[in-house]
Amino acid sequence: EPHSLRYNLTVLSWDGSVQSGFLTEVHLDGQPFLRCDRQKCRAKPQGQWAEDVLGNKTWDRETRDLTGNGKDLRMTLAHIKDQKEGLHSLQEIRVCEIHEDNSTRSSQHFYYDGELFLSQNLETKEWTMPQSSRAQTLAMNVRNFLKEDAMKTKTHYHAMHADCLQELRRYLKSGVVLRRTVPPMVNVTRSEASEGNITVTCRASGFYPWNITLSWRQDGVSLSHDTQQWGDVLPDGNGTYQTWVATRICQGEEQRFTCYMEHSGNHSTHPVPSGKVLVLQSHWQ
């Protein structure tokens, strides 16, 4: 997995008028890291993990950069001509990556009302756009504006690429992010599903990195994919992840089933707790 820094900026317009506020989210290695979500941007670390990476400092630099990016995007939205009545959004996602071989990748993507219409490889300066006519129209509109704006010259895009990588390297120097491994906490719960059946749920939380194997086994043999329901692997706000897997089994056969967990080369099995049903529910998780 490469190290990555991802900026997600969103600005809104209402009945053709660009709103003053904007939302900026920054993800570091896929984790929520910084956020600006008020009229006046103030970069806020997302959890203790982000604070540890940034250290004992103010986030003036991040606030300044994110505010500037927000203003740029608001100007861009103002130049999109086909805005109709109601609420519209323009989103810019900028990603830079540093791979294990030290090679880098940088890209920028624009979305209008949630639909991708323009992408740029910030290293090769190559633009790409979807085939739909709406996307093509929007893309031409935005590209023309960016060309006109002296701030958006080739130098600017090179700077965006370089700045993103510079920030990523700065964050990585903290050492908090570097290839750490945090093992999951695993717990198994049971709940009544229907007559003679119970639903058993295996939850893994607090783990990093996000790659994990979690599955139910009967007498040591994995249950088929379609007899299990998996939750998404989601950030839990602490710089770690959480997920779950559930299946339905016959009451009385609990001891035959185990939850198998594998993470970063470590593995463990977790039995279904015996005794009374803990939670009453009649459907999946």
Epitope: G220, V221, S222, C250
Partner: antibody, heavy 122, light 106 residues
Framework: EVQLVESGGGLVQPGGSMRLSCGAS????????MNWVRQAPGKGLEWISY????????YYADSVKGRFTISRDNAKNSLYLQMNSLRDEDTAVYYC???????????????WGQGTMVTVSS | DIQMTQSPSSLSASVGDRVTITCRAS??????LNWYQQKPGKVPKLLIY???TLQSGVPSRFSGSGSGTDFTLTISSLQPEDFATYYC????????FGGGTKVEIK
Amino acid sequence: EVQLVESGGGLVQPGGSMRLSCGASGFTFSSYSMNWVRQAPGKGLEWISYINSRSNTIYYADSVKGRFTISRDNAKNSLYLQMNSLRDEDTAVYYCARVSAITGNTGAFDIWGQGTMVTVSS
Amino acid sequence: DIQMTQSPSSLSASVGDRVTITCRASQSISSYLNWYQQKPGKVPKLLIYAASTLQSGVPSRFSGSGSGTDFTLTISSLQPEDFATYYCQQSYSTLTFGGGTKVEIK
């Protein structure tokens, strides 16, 4: 006594079909996962199919996928293997085997039938 | 699919010898490994499950070890009734047997 007894083997021509049965006694068949394993003359063991107690997890070896079908009837304490498009290389002794239910098991087969011989030849 | 490779494919030993058979998986299978013994004309018999747990009724001279990709079956002091073919089997991803190791009298 815990027992598995296979039946239905015999001689069949290439391209033909055959259905093997495995009758279980001495244990609660409906609670156990079951398998078919075969052994060609003078060769090693080859696992070919698995079915769990509720028939909602079924696996096949690549060598028989699409040609063989495993099934079970818990009311009759029976396991079945429907074999279609048989080939010469399917000639073997076919065993049914029970997956142990011991705590901490790792898919081990604790009870085996005596086997039934299937010969595919023209 | 996971391949299981046993070595050696055959070995000659004498009564009282310490015998070691290895089984290697083509990818990590955790401890989802079992060992069987099969005598000529007989059905296979489960010896060890979960890589190292002795099945009830199996003599303590049999032991298993290993985790991940490399596993070992050891017979500490070979007895006359131990001359047979031994198979490993994994259940980490569906199920597969190793090719077998024939233990013969020297």
